[in-house]
């Protein structure tokens, strides 16, 4: 079953290569277990950035080596992606699945265009 997912159109990463955005889904029921996946689309290629599952009201659990962190509040997921460089600029799509209880719902956002600008190196001081 389909579900609506909303996310901001554009986000500018900080000078430290950190970008945060909110992924909000219109839950048709009372989900207790949710899976969130962030995918990057660039040059028609789609790659998985990170994925997490969480029980409603709990922290998101990403893999240990994940560049993502996040928190949840109701039907909102606050996602933060770290370690971004200019080459990581692209469309970051939020995918939400309501895993339990049945029925299973799937929603895919339109994507957040994240712009990353590498900081200029500091000039040497004499």
């Amino acid at each position: 079953k389909a579900m609506h997912v909303a996310q901001p159109a554009v986000v500018l990463a900080s000078s430290r290569g950190i970008a945060s955005f909110v992924c909000e889904y219109a839950s048709p029921g009372k989900a207790t277990e949710v899976r969130v996946t962030v995918l990057r689309q660039a040059d028609s290629q789609v790659t998985e950035v990170c994925a997490a599952t969480y029980m409603m009201g709990n922290e998101l659990t990403f893999l240990d080596d994940s560049i993502c962190t996040g928190t949840s509040s109701g039907n909102q997921v606050n996602l933060t992606i770290q370690g971004l460089r200019a080459m990581d600029t692209g469309l970051y799509i939020c995918k939400v699945e309501l895993m339990y209880p049945p029925p299973y719902y799937l929603g895919i956002g339109n994507g957040t265009q994240i712009y990353v600008i590498d900081p200029e190196p500091c000039p040497d001081s004499d």
Partner: nanobody
């Protein structure tokens, strides 16, 4: 056109095992993910398990965790569901599904295979 064909269903006693297979045909392709869903008469569709190609990462519904194992053979474009310690509540039609890319959703579905667990 991609086709998914399931097999391996049947009637089994509680505590028994079955191995479902889902073969994809119709071309050479690399799926982002393949999974299994089930639906019992009069009940909502339930997610069972899936596996994502990128890292071979698997995910299971709590109701089957520790009893079911999903695996895939990329060379054969086939995904398997090994079901052990079956319970009467596992009785349902099991459907295989595949998604081409992570942002396409479950693009392709099989016709389903019936699993009946008697007590």
């Amino acid at each position: 056109e991609v086709q998914l064909v399931e097999s391996g269903g049947g009637l089994v006693q509680a505590g028994g095992s079955l191995r479902l297979s889902c073969a994809a045909s119709g071309g050479t392709f690399s799926f982002y993910g393949m999974g299994w869903f089930r639906q019992a008469p009069g009940k909502e569709q339930e997610f069972v398990a899936d596996i994502r190609t990128s890292a071979g990462r698997t995910y299971y519904a709590d109701s089957v965790k520790g009893r079911f194992t999903i695996s895939r053979d990329n060379a054969k474009n086939t995904v398997y569901l090994q079901m052990n310690s079956l319970k009467p509540e596992d009785t349902a039609t099991y459907y295989c599904a595949a998604e081409m890319s992570g942002i396409s959703g479950w693009d392709y579905w099989g016709q389903g295979t019936q699993v009946t667990v008697s007590s």
